[in-house]
């Protein structure tokens, strides 16, 4: 309807005596600005006067003046859209209808608003969700249809009269749509909250109680159970009886079924509130609980740990680790099922008690070979002593021990012999699989751990072997002590230091580099003739006749060795000179005659000189003097002289006779 003024405000406002009321309001006039405003209480239209009768709570005139008695009621609006009102304080007799008489230049309107003022503060209203389940978060809402700027209030939550520690969120609304104060509390109820009273309390600014609303919580929850056991500590011995009772302390809704569980698994045919266990065995040890269900779900009691005590069972030994390497650490663990746990242990090694070891574990920081063997143990608790189990085997691995190289040959060993050596050891784990020898050679290994040296050399001094499994152990080297004939025999001139001259004192030494055995004999030989048996051969005054090829021999018990032939050279001046004539000492004139100067000299003659019967030197210097043609005048005695680096020598006279030829005789 276009002829209506448009107003927006809450339909009814609520308050109580002494509080205040705030009326949010908006409007839109049909034309122009508001010129007059009157607030009536319970207005009634008078047809006679065509005006409204009633108590005037507020009146604004064209000049804008407000009577002083109207301070309780305030128009907070304006001339075109805001019509908000405030009444402070508000009284019980303010209840009823408020009429807003609005006049513009040409139009008039009466807008009605209901006001409900109670004698005392009215209670807030608690709103709960349709169903509350334990541990599921819910929001509790407390709503009060009141809010006024001039009258602050607070809403507080209580559980069984005690303020709730959860933080509530309070909100207010003062709008044309709604006026309220609301408190929201997020809360996770537990089963124990079932049946408890929740209160929302309205308080003034000073915390003074004004009013409240209460509700009883209906918390749906699974059955809450208590388990009781006889005996109370749930510790029994094999053969004893045990009784467990399940009590329902709370269930909402009522429970429907009962069952018992052991270690999480349901026990068959156990559907009553009492569980009787007769003549229990150790297998019945475990965690027991009862389970009762309702429409919400199953509820379980706390677990009762039933301990059936028994003497230790046969024990087993765990070894960390076998096989073990010598020097590594090893730990033995004695394992035996027992309740209570064993307090004492007895350990055995190869059946013999290991004194002083009473712990569950035995630790060896540095294992030795003799720790190998079978380990077993016995566990003991208050109920008795267990039996010894089968035991565990400790294998200790180590390199071969006490390795030795042994010569199999009869002693002594001679150069050229075939030598057999064996590599022996005392013990080894794992078994020896191969052998090594030092030094390396092209030798034969006829079988594992045996070395054959064919034609052993004089210089094969030491041999060492190693026996190897996962590791190699070397023996100390063994000396072959090979015996051999003297080696590198040679003749050495000791004196003179320079060349040997006839008449010198001469010493020759018979040297050798080595001999085994060391005891030796010497022999000197020249042209197959034995000269001496000393290491030295001495000449007091050497003569050219001593020159020649010398050898020395050195022998020991193994054999003898000769030196290479050594040539002794004696230097001497030309000697035994003589003049030989060819074809003879009588030559016919006209023929050829050759005179030769023969000599014995070392070094050979390097220079010849010829002399005649008058000791006159001839102009010839070679070994041969050739006369061709020979003349009778050449007849006479000749001699020669030979010279070398040592000295000179001269021959005796030799006579050449030259006779006349037949022709010469014929001419005479």
């Amino acid at each position: 309807d276009s002829s209506k003024w448009v107003f927006e405000h809450p339909e009814t406002l609520y308050a109580w005596e002494g509080a205040c009321v705030w009326i949010p309001c908006t409007y839109r006039a049909l034309d122009g600005d508001l010129e007059s405003f009157i607030l009536f209480h319970n207005p009634e239209y008078n047809k006679n006067t065509s005006k409204f009768d009633g108590t005037r709570l507020y009146e604004s005139t064209k000049d804008g003046k407000v009577p002083s008695e109207q301070k309780r009621v305030q128009f907070l609006g304006d001339k075109n859209k805001n019509c908000t009102l405030s009444i402070h304080p508000v009284h019980l007799n303010d209840s009823g209808q408020l009429g807003l008489r609005m006049e513009s230049k040409t139009e008039k309107w009466m807008e009605r608003i209901h006001l409900n003022v109670s004698e005392r503060p009215f209670p807030p209203h608690i709103q709960l969700p349709p169903e509350i389940q334990e541990s599921q978060e819910v929001t509790l809402t407390c709503l009060l249809n009141f809010s006024c700027y001039g009258y602050p209030i607070q809403l507080q939550w209580l559980l069984e009269g005690v303020p709730m520690r959860q933080a509530a969120v309070t909100s207010t609304s003062l709008t044309i749509k709604s006026v309220f104060t609301r408190s929201e509390l997020k809360f996770s109820p537990q089963w124990s909250h079932h049946g408890k009273i929740v209160t929302c309390q309205l308080q003034d600014a000073d915390g003074k109680f004004l009013s409240n609303d209460t509700v009883q919580l209906n918390v749906k929850h699974t059955p809450k159970l208590e388990i009781k056991v006889t005996p109370s500590d749930a510790i029994v011995r094999e053969g004893d009886s045990v009784t467990m009772t399940c009590e329902v302390s709370s269930s909402n809704p009522e429970y429907t079924t009962v069952s018992w569980l052991k270690d999480g698994t349901s026990l068959k045919k156990q559907n009553t509130f009492t569980l009787n266990l007769r003549e229990v065995t150790k297998d019945q040890s475990g965690k027991y609980c009862c389970q009762v269900s309702n429409d919400v779900g199953p509820g379980r009691s706390e677990e009762v740990f039933l301990q059936v005590q028994y003497a230790p069972e046969p024990s087993t030994v765990q070894i960390l680790h076998s096989p073990a390497v010598e020097g590594s650490q090893v730990e033995f663990l004695c394992m035996s099922l027992a309740n209570p746990l064993p307090t004492n242990y007895t350990w055995y090694h190869n059946g013999k008690e290991m004194q002083g070891r009473t712990e569950e574990k035995v630790h060896i920081p540095k294992i030795l070979p003799w720790h190998a063997g079978t380990y077993s143990c016995v566990a003991e608790n208050i109920l008795g002593t267990g039996q010894r189990g089968p035991g565990a085997e400790l294998d200790v691995q180590y390199p071969p021990k006490k390795v030795t190289t042994v010569i199999q040959n009869p002693m002594p060993i001679r150069e050229g012999d075939t030598v057999t050596l064996s590599c022996n050891y005392n013990s080894s784990n794992p078994s020896v699989t191969r052998y090594e020898w030092k030094p390396h050679g092209a030798w034969e290994e006829p079988s594992l751990g045996v070395l054959k040296i064919q034609n052993v050399g004089w210089d094969n001094t030491t041999i060492a072997c190693a026996a190897c499994n996962s590791w190699c152990s070397w023996a100390s080297p063994v000396a072959l002590n090979v015996q051999y004939a003297p080696r590198d025999v040679r003749v050495r001139k000791i004196k003179p230091l320079s060349e040997i001259h006839s008449g010198n004192s001469v010493s020759l030494q018979c040297d050798f580099s080595s001999s085994h055995p060391k005891e030796v004999q010497f022999f000197w030989e020249k042209n197959g003739r034995l000269l001496g048996k000393e290491s030295q051969l001495n000449f007091d005054s050497i003569s050219p006749e001593d020159a020649g090829s010398y050898s020395c021999w050195v022998n020991n018990s193994i054999g003898q060795t000769a030196s290479k032939a050594w040539t002794l050279e004696v230097l001497y001046a030309p000697r035994r000179l003589r003049v030989s004539m060819s074809p003879g000492d009588q030559v016919m004139e006209g023929k050829s005659a050759t005179l030769t100067c023969e000599s014995d000299a070392n070094p050979p003659v390097s220079h010849y000189t010829w002399f005649d019967w008058n000791n006159q030197s001839l102009p010839y210097h070679s070994q041969k003097l050739r006369l061709e043609p020979v003349k009778v005048q050449h007849s006479g005695a000749y001699w020669c002289q030979g010279t070398n680096s040592v000295g000179k020598g001269r021959s005796p006279l030799s006579t050449l006779t030259v006779y006349y030829s037949p022709e010469t005789i014929g001419r005479r």
């Epitope: 090694h349 290991m354 004194q355 002083g356 630790h363 060896i364 920081p365 540095k366 030795l368 003799w370």
Partner: nanobody, 125 residues
């Protein structure tokens, strides 16, 4: 026979610590089982702790968790670390040695041949 010389004894308050040393005249590692023994006035000598060449140890029940036996092969020295000492630990402490002739023959109840002169330990409350 080997000579053994103990040191490190003394007086200490209850709850305190001491470290005893025993120097051997010969190289003992690998061939000897070594031990600590004690004798309180008017009481019999009792085994305290032993150690063998494999490093395996044994202890008297009264000292387990408080005392630690160890050796230093390079120094040829045996040690006894004593923590949380009690008045009942007061005694003359002796170092001893025996041949290591079987793998598990080294324990506090074994017979020991060679003995040191001892070192006094006094724990007051």
């Amino acid at each position: 026979q080997i000579q053994l010389v103990e040191s490190g004894g003394g007086s200490v308050q209850s709850g305190g610590s001491l470290r005893l040393s025993c120097k051997a005249s010969v190289y003992t590692w690998g061939t000897y089982c070594m031990g600590w023994f004690r004798q309180a006035p008017g009481k019999e000598r009792e085994g305290v702790a032993t150690i063998d060449p494999a490093g395996t140890t044994t202890y008297a029940n009264s000292v387990k968790g408080r005392f630690t036996i160890s050796d230093d092969n390079a120094q040829n020295t045996l040690y006894l670390q004593m923590n949380s000492l009690r008045p009942e630990d007061t005694a003359m402490y002796y170092c001893a040695a025996r041949a290591y002739d079987a793998p598990w023959a080294c324990w506090t109840g074994a017979v020991f041949r060679d003995w040191g002169q001892g070192t006094q330990v006094t724990v007051s409350s």
